[in-house]
């Protein structure tokens, strides 16, 4: 997150981190039920760990943290690397969470976000993609949903209904390491960090997010059948 601020502790209890090895954070994730996470499909790895209820970037133990293994990763069937369409993936964890003030699921928005909606994006990603600086704690940033026209003008030929743009204030953006993390609008999960230009936070090159309202049925059906 570029030019965000430290999240209040436990204010994003649905925020998850996907880790390679003991502590290599490579993507964010979102808790949507006691045993299921959403993340970006491009975050798929054969083996990874899941950390919930953690505030710090460092591996230091925190009392609210809960660690899990992913036992099933189900990318959306319409996702195809290196494209960005349908960039979401369900992860089933090896057990259910212990519900606490630090770890709680978020409800997915059924209605699509409209232009001007204020949302919160969060993550432990780099705070400057040109220098790869990382925050000490989870970062939060208020962003604004942009019109479809403005989104398409920013990225001609690359935007479809499975995406929306948000941000566009120069110097404020999600960034590398934030992928798969939540965009929450009016208390509901509206999107996942997906892609954008490099480096992050450039004028007229907003962050692009997976448009979850288009996938509510697939998410529910997939969870029910697994």
């Amino acid at each position: 997150i570029v030019n965000g601020s430290d999240c209040q502790k436990d204010a994003q209890p649905w925020q998850g981190a996907l880790l390679l090895g003991p502590n290599k954070l490579y993507c964010g994730a979102v808790l949507i039920s006691p045993q299921w996470l959403l993340t970006a499909a491009h975050c798929r790895k054969p083996v990874f760990r899941i950390r919930l209820g953690h505030h710090s970037m460092s591996p230091v133990y925190e009392s609210g943290q809960q660690m899990f293994q992913g036992i099933k990763s189900i990318p959306h069937p319409g996702y195809s690397h290196p494209g960005h369409s349908n960039d979401l993936m369900l992860i089933k964890m090896n057990r259910k969470i212990r519900d606490s003030h630090s770890v709680k699921p978020v409800e997915i928005a059924c209605d699509c976000a409209t232009e001007g909606t204020r949302c919160m994006v969060s993550g432990w990603g780099t705070t400057s993609s040109s220098h790869n600086n990382f925050p000490k704690v989870l970062q939060c940033l208020n962003i604004t949903v942009l019109s479809e026209e403005r989104c398409k003008n920013s990225y001609p030929g690359q935007i479809d209904k499975t995406m929306f743009c948000a941000g566009d204030e120069e110097g404020r953006d999600s960034c590398q390491g934030d992928s798969g993390g939540p965009v929450v609008c009016n208390g509901k999960l509206q999107g996942l960090v997906s892609w954008g230009d490099f480096p992050c936070a450039q004028r007229n090159r907003p962050g692009v997010y997976t448009n979850l309202c288009e996938f509510v049925k697939w998410i529910k059906d997939t969870m029910n059948s697994n």
Epitope: K24, H42, M57, F134, S179, G180, G196, F198, G207
Partner: antibody
Framework: QVQLVQSGAEVKKPGSSVKVSCKAS????????ISWVRQAPGQGLEWMGG????????VYAQKFQGRVTITADESTSTAYMELSSLRSEDTAVYYC????????????????????WGQGTTVTVSS | DIQMTQSPSSVSASVGDRVTITCRAS??????LAWYQQKPGKAPKLLIY???SLQSGVPSRFSGSGSGTDFTLTISSLQPEDFATYYC?????????FGGGTKVEIK
Amino acid sequence: QVQLVQSGAEVKKPGSSVKVSCKASGGTFSGYVISWVRQAPGQGLEWMGGIFPISGYAVYAQKFQGRVTITADESTSTAYMELSSLRSEDTAVYYCARASASGYYDRSYYYYGMDVWGQGTTVTVSS
Amino acid sequence: DIQMTQSPSSVSASVGDRVTITCRASQGISSWLAWYQQKPGKAPKLLIYAASSLQSGVPSRFSGSGSGTDFTLTISSLQPEDFATYYCQQVSSFPQTFGGGTKVEIK
């Protein structure tokens, strides 16, 4: 301009250990990966392992597992590579190198290549 | 571990020649490939990252291409300072293995 400055040449006996340092001058380690690469005389490059100084997480090539330890001190922007149970075939030039760690257009966090290298440290293992 | 196979192991060429070096990964690595140049007694120098992105300060006669398992480094018009050994490295997963190297020699 960041430079990686390594410690001086070492001559070691078989069975002993060597610890090579790598200090970043004019910059920081934060948000980078520091890798160690060695090159035996007349041979190619061999990746030994790397460390994410921000988390202290180190990863090693299987070949060196149990024999190499990579550490980093963020406060002094110095990384260390210690290789134990030395044998003659460990005679090589040892390089540290810095890699930017990021995704590209997607916003996952991953690697680029190693854009800044140390000058190399010659380690000779001989009885 | 992912094996990286470079070919040819050496190539003789003249100034002005177009030189192509290939690198094959034993499994798909998307675009997570870097190319380095090394001169005798010197540390390697990064030329290309993410398979095709030119590192800052590297002459545009160097270019990289490929994705998945097959990659190419091309020097469009060889210059005297380009005679060196070139290595590919996959940075997709650990250990970050190198190819065996290609020595570009003067014909």
